[in-house]
């Protein structure tokens, strides 16, 4: 029977800068029941606080609700593991909420084949930012990426859309059914998951463009 091994805070994420959750990985348990607590202070403070919510994020997690989350203050946190034989502490972790944002996927992806009379046909898609993200404040810049592939293909074709919420693709294989997805990333944070796939049937008379490129 031994004191517990050193835990590690291995992930912190926020969906929108208004709340966030951190998760830790326990070290060895020393063969005894082990209690874990996460303590933190904010920059400029010496007063230590205990995790406000060990439940919401699931096992080995600490959730900071709206009233505990500040974008303007860095959090300095550590996890303490304790059993009857002693204690161990994780490394201190510095958390700036701006740098842990991982949004939900974009919404309402719609895809259409456009066949203008005077120009080559193209695939047109548009989407909306995730609802939790408030882009009007200017705190957020969301970047978007699209991927698509014929239904039976193994490889995805990826296009970076920048900050736009619509996109055109000119080069597609006629007669194929395509899967299309979109994801987003804040300028300092993490890519969202891909949106659910949208399917689009490319008509057999779709004229393949000479150049494999896209227009914004």
């Amino acid at each position: 029977q031994l004191p517990p091994g050193k835990p590690e805070i291995f992930k912190c994420r926020s969906p929108n800068k208004e709340t966030f959750t951190c998760w830790w990985r326990p070290g060895t348990d020393g063969g005894l029941p082990t209690n874990y607590s996460l303590t933190y202070h904010r920059e400029g403070e010496t007063l230590m606080h205990e995790c406000p919510d060990y439940i919401t994020g699931g096992p080995n997690s600490c959730h900071f609700g709206k009233q505990y989350t500040s974008m303007w203050r860095t959090y300095v946190m550590m996890v303490n593991a304790t059993n009857q034989m002693g204690s161990s502490f994780s490394d201190e972790l510095y958390v700036d909420v701006t740098y842990i944002v991982q949004p939900d996927p974009p919404l309402e992806l719609t895809v259409e084949v456009k066949q203008p009379e005077d120009r080559k046909p193209y695939l047109w898609m548009k989407w909306s930012p995730p609802t939790l993200i408030d882009l009007k404040t200017g705190w957020f810049t969301l970047l978007y990426e699209i991927r698509l592939k014929p239904e039976k293909a193994a490889e995805w074709e990826t296009h970076f859309a920048g900050q736009q919420t619509e996109f055109k693709i000119l080069s597609l294989h006629p007669g194929q059914k395509y899967l299309v997805q979109v994801r987003c990333k804040p300028d300092h944070g993490y890519w969202s998951a891909w949106s659910p796939a949208t399917f689009i049937q490319i008509p057999s008379d779709f004229i393949m463009n000479d150049h494999h490129h896209h227009h914004h």
């Epitope: 590690e8 974008m71 860095t74 200017g138």
Partner: antibody, heavy 118, light 112 residues
Framework: EVQLVQSGAEVKKPGSSVKVSCKAS????????MHWVRQAPGQGLEWMGV????????NYNQKFKGRVTITADESTSTAYMELSSLRSEDTAVYYC???????????WGQGTLVTVSS | DVVMTQTPLSLSVTPGQPASISCRSS???????????LHWYLQKPGQSPQLLIY???NRFSGVPDRFSGSGSGTDFTLKISRVEAEDVGVYYC?????????FGGGTKVEIK
């Protein structure tokens, strides 16, 4: 204990490429972004770029105009910085550096001296 | 790119005496999120840099309280209240508000 251990010193010819490695231990490699910073002899520090090892997203200092490529190998917890079209002014100590969930550098590698000379 | 200008270039200080280093940025360093990402690093002889102060005035873990940072906008200062022999090295200010992140040219502190 977090450690960043870099590969050894290199001597390269102008026009060639160099690839410096940075092996991370003591933490979950994919959890934190890895940066590269260089320091020419007797000079200050210069940020080159960063990688998110969890999905290989990169952001580079435009000064290096496509000459720098940062990669990460999750299976070995190792980050790499490759610099091509080397010139004498690329002679420098190259550091890998890790932040926490922040935008400053909490941990640094020991540095790798790259000498470019004909 | 944001240019960071440090003064003085070098500083020779008697142990126990104070020291002050100035750092001026060519652009304001207030991020769109309201934070000012101005940091100070110390590179001791033969070593990698180490973080001293983050976000203008916050001492990093384990940094003695004789080190303090202040400033706002484009003008920032690092003060050492009583210099000790172990404080010798080159001090760098750094901004990470704007990409690319940039560093000052460094201030070399030596003991008289």
């Amino acid at each position: 204990e977090v450690q960043l251990v870099q590969s050894g010193a290199e001597v390269k010819k102008p026009g060639s490429s160099v690839k410096v490695s940075c092996k991370a231990s003591g933490y979950t490699f994919t959890s934190f972004w890895m940066h590269w910073v260089r320091q020419a002899p007797g000079q200050g520090l210069e940020w080159m770029g960063v990688i998110d090892p969890s999905d290989t997203y990169t952001n580079y200092n435009q000064k290096f105009k496509g000459r720098v490529t940062i990669t990460a190998d999750e299976s070995t917890s190792t980050a790499y910085m490759e610099l091509s079209s080397l010139r004498s002014e690329d002679t420098a100590v190259y550091y890998c550096a890790r932040g926490d969930y922040s935008n400053w550098f909490t941990y640094w590698g020991q540095g790798t001296l790259v000498t470019v000379s004909s | 790119d944001v240019v960071m200008t440090q003064t003085p270039l070098s500083l020779s200080v008697t142990p126990g005496q104070p020291a002050s280093i100035s750092c001026r940025s060519s652009q304001r360093l207030v991020h769109s999120n309201g934070n000012t990402y101005l940091h100070w690093y110390l590179q001791k002889p033969g070593q990698s840099p180490q973080l001293l102060i983050y976000k203008v005035s916050n001492r990093f873990s384990g940094v003695p309280d004789r080190f303090s940072g202040s400033g706002s906008g484009t003008d920032f200062t690092l003060k050492i209240s009583r210099v000790e022999a172990e404080d010798v090295g080159v001090y760098y200010c750094s901004q990470s508000t704007h990409v690319p992140w940039t560093f000052g040219g460094g201030t070399k502190v030596e003991i008289k």
